[in-house]
């Protein structure tokens, strides 16, 4: 028998520092938990302490924090590097900034293969990316070879921006020949390694023949067998075995995201490939793992230019943002339209001629917005001033919602109103009326939302049971706020773009911005 | 700057064996795999063996498999190839390379030494 | 014997456009990424194309790569006298767990 220990990261969203509990920025260190510096130290323990080590990276490695803001991905390739990872499946964000940002600062720095088999380029991008990424590598390990094919989202398009010259295909027809083809060259150990999720990851290892294991990203699925040691909630056990249509047990596993835990997967395989035995569980980085003293330097660093970024002008603003908890929790603020208004341009996709865009509608928290933006300073915005109106370090994420759970939530943003509660919604590309006098749970009396299969956009009334695409927090996806409704209800979810990122990639593109109240929100006469 | 220097080559008889070292400087060593290819006179290049950042995986080629080891001294900076049971065909201007990632599952060398010239002949 | 087949030599005259093929295997070319090296005389070889098609910092655009199937090909334009080298492909063979070059081919300017 030969044994292999997979170490694993996934979603790890620009998390080079270490973190509070909840991946937002660490305040107490002596509570932070991951970091590439904690990662270091725990990943080298093991390489010294067992013979047969990978270290993976399921993707997403790009988007979530001032770190990939600045340095778009050359702080990703050089810490990657540093901490000597072995493989990295593609996600849908190493797309965020096209394929160039993809091509320039990682796939020509990294020191490991990069992969995706069911991404295929076409036209002149064929040559100039050819060989920068793989459908596979065959990787020594010991006296053995392992052979990792990758895989991403083919939801891709709609999340991120790829460009016209990539197709996604689908994950499994593309996934079938290349292992079919490592499987003639005599590589009999093969991990699938990608970015599309656990139902997927699941998918895979139940269809595709000669997979062995499933290394997995894209949803942060938090698997863990006994006693979860901090506050995620398992979604079955690590590794999660799935029957193969072939009658083969395949774990699959999958390390939550932002870098919290190393998943740590224990492979033990017979003379002809076939799995003998998996265990282990996702190792949580804690306070209790130190950080590597030269990463933590070299992070340091790095991080000089990150103070001096964050007091840069951004854009201009001629108008007073109003981000007051007095107006955004009770009425339609400016800045919530501002929000919206940016959380939209950053969805904008135009893959279907059918379509003007592929969603046109945004719902925040208003209790999300914790601070307004003074125009009297020469109407400078920075980063700074951003992070001031958005400090919890969220996404902007995408969301498939039926009508009759949109107009629930609009219920529920006004069921205890006047008591300056967080759930008011502000909105973009929605037009709500409440009438207040009514009770609690019937208060909508109109809900307009504007087209997406249409040429000239246009507001119509919401369908109960058509589906709907909205950008929101992730903070409202997971059901904060009490919004259970769209947690409970929701069709699909795609993590997206760190919320300050987005709001500044739209000022520095308008340069100067003059949002307004534009009756996106009413309220009936008599009731207001 | 980033160099190589290999040493430890000369005559050798048939049978006998050698050490060639490579000393590396001007970058990172552990960072990277490091590899010796050889030339015969008049000949191509023909891969020798390989060795990943760690040590954790190592490859030769059929020609010297059991014969030659490679190791090498992070601390040390420095590639070392053990030459035993050495044959008339092993003679050639033996080369250390530096790979441009730090798994020895590659075929880009992007620094290369000028060369040890190894003899065997009786 | 060398797992990748070259063509022993190639040639042309200043300015024009030369090819160099370079035929491997599903376990070599077909899996993993080429390298190409010049290899002039009395030095070392150095890298020309990494990783298909891609040119390190310094080596002229005249040199290009390209990649289809289980053959790699090396594209000089322009030819110039100091091109006059050997040239070689290699890349990872899966199955021999090993690099392997091609036996070289000797490219004269004429």
């Known amino acids: 028998a030969w044994e292999l220990t997979i170490l694993h990261t996934n979603d790890v969203h620009s998390r080079l520092e270490q973190t509070s509990e909840d991946s937002s920025k660490c305040v107490n260190a002596s509570r932070c938990m991951g970091g590439v510096a904690r990662l270091f130290t725990k990943v080298q323990q093991i390489r010294r302490a067992e013979p047969n080590v990978l270290l993976l990276d399921a993707g997403d490695q790009y988007q979530g924090t001032i770190w990939f803001t600045v340095y778009k991905g050359a702080e990703v390739a050089h810490f990657m590097n540093a901490l000597r990872y072995d493989a990295m499946a593609l996600g849908n964000h190493e797309f965020d900034n096209g394929v160039e940002g993809l091509i320039e600062p990682l796939l020509k720095e990294a020191k490991f293969p990069i992969l995706s088999a069911n991404i295929k380029a076409k036209g002149p991008l064929a040559s100039q990316i050819s060989g920068l990424y793989l459908p596979y590598k065959v990787l020594p390990v010991g006296d053995e070879v392992v052979g990792i094919v990758g895989y991403t989202s083919k939801e891709t398009p709609f999340l991120s921006n790829p460009g016209t010259n990539l197709v996604f295909e689908d994950e499994i027809t593309a996934l079938q020949p290349e292992v079919d083809k490592l499987k003639t060259l005599n590589v009999n150990k093969i991990i699938a390694l990608g970015h599309s999720g656990f139902e997927m990851d699941k998918l895979i290892a139940q269809k595709v023949r000669g997979v062995d294991v499933v290394v997995g990203g894209h949803s942060n699925t938090f698997l863990y067998t006994g006693n979860p040691p901090s506050k995620e909630v398992p979604a079955g056990k690590y590794p999660f075995i799935v029957t193969s249509d072939d009658g083969r047990k395949v774990p699959v596993v999958q390390a939550y995201a932002f870098g919290k835990y190393l998943g740590y997967l224990k492979i033990e395989f017979d003379e002809r490939g076939n799995v003998i035995s998996s265990h282990g569980n996702p190792i949580l980085l804690n306070s209790s793992i130190p950080e590597d003293p030269s990463i933590k330097a070299d992070i340091n660093k790095w991080r000089i230019k990150l103070d001096n970024y964050s007091t840069q002008e951004l854009g201009k603003t001629i108008v007073y943002l109003d981000g007051s908890s007095q107006s955004c929790r009770f009425r339609e603020c400016n800045m919530g339209n501002l929000i919206c208004d940016a959380m939209i341009n950053n969805n904008l996709r135009h893959t279907d001629e059918m379509f003007w865009n592929h969603v046109s509608m945004c719902i925040l928290n208003g209790g999300g917005i914790r601070s307004p933006i003074d125009e009297r300073n020469n109407g400078t915005i920075t980063w700074e001033n951003l992070a001031a109106v958005l400090p919890f370090g969220g996404t902007f994420d995408l969301v498939q919602l039926k009508g009759s759970t949109l107009k629930k939530a609009f219920e529920h943003s006004v069921h205890r109103y006047g008591q300056s509660t967080g759930e008011f919604l502000q909105v973009g590309g929605i037009h709500v009326v409440y009438d207040l006098s009514r009770k609690p749970g019937d208060r909508v009396v109109k809900l307009d939302v504007l087209c997406t299969k249409c040429r000239v956009p246009s507001y119509d009334p919401l369908k109960m049971d058509e589906v709907y695409k909205v950008i929101l927090p992730n903070f409202l996806a997971n059901g904060g706020d009490g919004f259970q409704m769209i947690k409970d209800e929701l069709l699909r979810h795609d993590s997206g773009d760190q919320d300050i990122n987005v709001v500044s990639t739209y000022i520095s593109k308008m340069k100067v911005i003059y949002p307004a109240v534009e009756g996106r929100i009413k309220f009936s006469t008599g009731s207001h | 700057q980033v160099q190589l220097v290999e040493s430890g080559g000369g005559l050798v008889q048939p049978g006998r064996s050698l050490r060639l070292s490579c000393a590396a400087s001007?970058?990172?060593?552990?960072?990277?795999?490091m590899h010796w290819v050889r030339q015969a006179p008049g000949k191509g290049l023909e891969w020798v063996s390989g060795?990943?950042?760690?040590?954790?995986?190592?490859g030769y080629a059929d020609s010297v498999k059991g014969r030659f080891t490679i190791s090498r001294d992070n601390a040390k900076n420095s590639l070392y190839l053990q030459m035993n049971s050495l044959r008339a065909e092993d003679t050639a201007l033996y080369y250390c390379a530096k790979a441009r990632g730090y798994s020895y599952g590659e075929g880009a060398f992007d620094i290369w030494g000028q060369g040890t010239m190894v003899t065997v002949s009786s | 014997s060398y797992e990748l087949t070259q063509p022993p030599s190639a040639s042309g005259t200043p300015g024009q456009r030369v090819t160099i093929s370079c035929s491997g295997s599903?376990?070599?070319?077909?899996?993993?990424?080429v390298t190409w090296y010049q290899n002039l005389p009395g030095t070392a070889p150095h890298v020309v194309i990494y990783?298909?098609?891609q040119r390190p910092s310094g080596v002229p655009d005249r040199f290009s790569g390209s990649k289809s199937g289980t053959s790699a090909s090396l594209a000089i334009t322009g030819l110039q006298s100091e091109d006059e080298a050997d040239y070689y492909c290699?890349?990872?063979?899966?199955?021999?767990?090993?690099?392997?070059f091609g036996g070289g081919t000797k490219l004269t300017v004429l």
């Open positions: 290699a890349t990872w063979d899966a199955s021999l767990k090993a690099v392997v």
């Open positions: 599903s376990s070599n070319i077909g899996s993993d990424t």
């Open positions: 060795i990943s950042w760690n040590s954790g995986s190592i």
């Open positions: 001007g970058f990172t060593f552990d960072d990277y795999a």
């Open positions: 990783s298909n098609s």
